[in-house]
């Protein structure tokens, strides 16, 4: 039994780091392998992660961590019974994939304005809480070409857009993801999407000429 692709890990910079690797043949990861990990620090204990299968020869392990600071470094030992297959280390702050934002809501009760809000996925005591920026993806269910990305580079987890920038009378979906420049993170996964029906009162002169486009809230 050998490691074909060495473990690579990403951290959510809060409580979970996920490591993936490939073996040289089909493997029952949970029964045959163990990934031991230990923070390089005074009182730290070694922890054991039981991997799960991720495809025939692939394995994935979710390493649980109580907290994280920038300087953290973990030792990683991959064992098959008494045989050490691989030894390495992992610095969470250098491989961050943020948690996905949650609770995406579209508020359509503000006149002619869409307000999208979502929740920051980190608590205030986490460094990333004040360092996330976001991308909001809005698309039409009816028209695949009607697909747009809004970059939210301020800290507030919200976006205001004029309802008139979208087509009236059709359904749209939105989703949001996050990243942090400070740790040069990858993008988070997308949040679950939310759906709404876009309708707005067109300006009077348009209403006058295009009465059939008029939609009430």
């Amino acid at each position: 039994m050998k490691v074909l692709q060495e473990p690579t890990c990403v951290s959510d910079y809060m409580s979970i780091s996920t490591c993936e690797w490939k073996m040289n043949g089909p493997t029952n990861c949970s029964t045959e392998l163990r990934l031991l990990y230990q923070l390089v620090f005074l009182l730290s204990e070694a922890h054991t992660c039981i991997p799960e299968n991720n495809g025939g020869a692939g394995c994935v392990c979710h390493l649980l961590m109580d907290d994280v600071v920038s300087a953290d470094n973990y030792t990683l030992d991959l064992w098959a019974g008494q045989q050490l297959l691989w030894k390495g280390s992992f610095k969470p702050s250098e491989h961050v994939k943020p948690r996905a934002p949650g609770n995406l809501t579209v508020h359509t009760n503000v006149s002619d304005t869409l307000l999208l809000t979502w929740s920051n996925p980190y608590p205030p005591d986490n460094y990333l809480y004040n360092h996330l920026t976001y991308a909001v993806n809005i698309w039409s269910e009816n028209d695949p070409a009607d697909f747009r990305i809004y970059n939210v580079t301020y800290l507030e987890p919200s976006l205001r857009i004029a309802a008139s920038t979208l087509k009236s009378g059709i359904s749209y979906r939105a989703r949001v993801r996050a990243w942090a420049q400070c740790y040069n993170t990858t993008w988070s996964e997308w949040s679950p999407s939310t759906k709404w029906h876009n309708s707005y009162r067109e300006p009077f002169e348009q209403h006058h000429h295009h009465h059939h486009h008029h939609h009430h809230h």
């Epitope: 809060m14 409580s15 979970i16 620090f41 005074l42 009182l43 649980l64 961590m65 109580d66 907290d67 600071v69 920038s70 300087a71 953290d72 980190y122 608590p123 205030p124 005591d125 460094y127 004040n130 400070c182």
Partner: antibody, heavy 116, light 112 residues
């Protein structure tokens, strides 16, 4: 041996500022969060705030926002807390504590007395 | 802010007898990572506090096994199975799950 050694007692007049220090030995403060805890005479423990020494990220209890400023110097392995606009109610022993992820190591405390 | 309420505020125990201190939080102290950072500290007279229990039930290294922690949700308990003279001092519960972190008001243990 792990130790947190704090600076000596201070006596200050109302309105003054004091800066107390906490030097760590036996470990690197970059590997922990450094916290400060207040203990007024004959009273209980009160969390003031904390710093991640590597990036300087601080958080404070709301009542100490504007009162306490926590800093760290990783080159000297020392954390600091400055208390401004001192009043009699700031008289207390202030403990520095390393947390990773619990308060395993405490400094001996620094008594700050505010008296006119 | 989460308020940590300890009962009783003082207790007097005969050596060899058990003692129990309760700590109730005003809301859940489960961290968003799923852990409950409820700790117990003992401050002996003239000393800095020392860690006894972390994450509700885990004894810190060097802490005698007569100390045990239990609880979940908002109700937590520290038990001393047989009190010894060296156990005197003030016991504090602490939550490190939500900012601002907060201590209980303390329970003073005396020996009869």
């Amino acid at each position: 041996e792990v130790q947190l050694v704090q600076s000596g007692a201070e006596v200050k007049k109302p309105g003054a500022t004091v800066k107390i220090s906490c030097k760590a030995s036996g470990f690197n403060i970059k590997d922990t969060y450094m916290h400060w805890v207040k203990q007024a005479p004959g009273k209980g423990l009160e969390w003031v705030g904390r710093i991640d020494p590597t990036n300087g990220y601080t958080i404070y209890a709301s009542k100490f926002q504007g009162k306490a400023t926590i800093t760290a110097d990783t080159s000297s392995n020392t954390a600091y807390m400055e208390l401004s606009s001192l009043r009699s109610e700031d008289t207390a022993v202030y403990h520095c504590v390393s947390r990773r992820p619990w308060f395993a190591y405490w400094g001996q405390g620094t008594l700050v007395t505010v008296s006119s | 802010d989460i308020v940590m309420t300890q009962t009783p505020l003082s207790l007097s125990v005969t050596p060899g007898q058990p003692a129990s201190i309760s700590c109730r939080s005003s809301q859940s102290i489960v961290h968003s990572n799923g852990n409950t950072y409820l700790e117990w500290y003992l401050q002996k007279p003239g000393q800095s506090p020392q860690l006894l229990i972390y994450k509700v039930t885990n004894r810190f290294s060097g802490v005698p096994d007569r100390f045990s922690g239990s609880g979940s949700g908002t109700d937590f308990t520290l038990k001393i199975s047989r009190v010894e003279a060296e156990d005197v001092g003030v016991y504090y519960c602490f939550q490190g799950s939500h900012v601002p972190y907060t201590f209980g008001q303390g329970t003073k243990l005396e020996i009869k």
